[in-house]
């Protein structure tokens, strides 16, 4: 049996016997184009492709449409994997989305969606989510039904304002909505009453800017 040399996601890497968390090279579906991603092989059985991570404010998340499309940052630290890759990947198979959150008081919580995909760029990478469970709120902090993605140079929200400019970062803004994990990073003791912070309303309420966030995906049949 020939050894698999290209992987579409971290679940395939895990199943190939590579079970250490770290940076791996993934290949776009139906393409030879490659992308580097962080694979979490420890959480909940492993095989998770990390699509977003915040931890210290070292990376600027107020980026352009093109940057959010292609990805930015470092997979070893803060980064955004890229909307185009995630859209293509989640359009091929059914994926779950896990969002892990940390506050400044040492608490952790998560939201798990049992079906997640992004529409294509022609639909502004609109997010589709169903089946919420977890400890970070009984109501989805990502507005339902899903919104189009907006950035500072591509305003696709439902607000009379430009949410990405007002709140900072690219996100699936509604008007503007109960979450923004790509907002401005604020350090401890400066993280409350913020209009543009890292927000997950149905866990921490309004104006609370979180310490750390991770968004990761895995095939539903893993």
């Amino acid at each position: 049996k020939e050894e698999q040399t290209t992987f579409r996601d971290c679940a395939e890497i895990f199943k190939s016997g590579l079970t250490t968390s770290g940076i791996y090279t993934l290949t776009f579906p139906n393409s030879t184009e490659e992308i580097k991603a962080y694979c979490d092989m420890d959480v909940g059985g492993g095989g998770w492709t990390v699509i977003q991570h915040r931890e210290d404010g070292s990376v600027d998340f107020q980026r352009t449409w093109k940057e959010y499309k292609e990805g930015f940052g470092s997979p070893l630290g803060e980064y955004w994997l890229g909307n185009e890759f995630v859209s293509q990947l989640t359009g091929q198979h059914r994926y779950v989305l896990k969002i892990q959150l940390k506050d400044w008081e040492g608490n952790e919580a998560h939201s798990l969606y049992d079906h997640f995909y992004l529409a294509g760029e022609e639909s502004n990478y609109r997010i589709h989510l169903t089946g919420l469970t977890g400890t970070a709120g009984k109501i989805s902090s990502i507005s339902q039904p899903g919104s189009d993605f907006s950035t500072k140079d591509s305003d696709n929200d439902k607000c009379i304002c430009k949410c990405s400019q007002m709140l900072s970062g690219g996100w699936w803004f509604d008007a503007c909505g109960p979450s923004n994990l790509n907002g401005q990073y604020y350090p401890q003791k400066q993280n409350t009453n913020k209009f543009n912070g890292i927000k997950w309303y149905y866990w921490k309420g309004s104006g609370y800017s979180l310490k750390a966030t991770t968004m990761m995906i895995r095939p539903a049949d893993f």
Partner: nanobody
Framework: EVQLVESGGGLVQPGGSLRLSCAVS????????IGWFRQAPGKEREGVSA????????YYADSVKGRFTISSDNSKNTVYLQMNSLRPEDTAVYYC??????????????????????WGQGTLVTVSS
């Protein structure tokens, strides 16, 4: 740093009146809407009233219409809630909160609670004989 400080709460008899104040610093009222919310023990926080100083428009929950009046003094950067004909069911901790005035959905006039990102610590209003 944005700060909102409520004052004016206390114990009042049914039918009585109170005036709550919300002193705002770190932002100017012209650019923001200020809302009053309340939370009774064991209940969800609910919207009571709100004002957009720039346009002078106001909002009231049905339960307080005709009894409560919201106003603002931009020179003092303060918003007031005049509460008349108070009832025992008005007993709650009252909070003021701020939201950028432009953060409005197309076709809507007011804001969901999750859009208010800056909050005060609250002032207790008790209506009892």
């Amino acid at each position: 740093e944005v700060q909102l400080v409520e004052s004016g709460g206390g114990l009042v008899q049914p039918g009585g009146s109170l005036r709550l104040s919300c002193a705002v610093s770190g932002i100017t009222l012209d650019d923001y809407a200020i809302g009053w919310f309340r939370q009774a023990p064991g209940k969800e926080r609910e919207g009571v009233s709100a004002i957009r100083s720039s346009g002078g428009s106001t909002y009231y929950a049905d339960s307080v219409k005709g009894r409560f009046t919201i106003s603002s003094d931009n020179s003092k950067n303060t918003v007031y809630l005049q509460m008349n004909s108070l009832r025992p069911e008005d007993t709650a901790v009252y909070y003021c909160a701020a939201v950028p005035a432009g953060r409005l959905r197309y076709g809507e006039q007011w804001y969901p609670i999750y859009e208010y990102d800056a909050w005060g610590q609250g002032t207790l209003v008790t209506v009892s004989s």
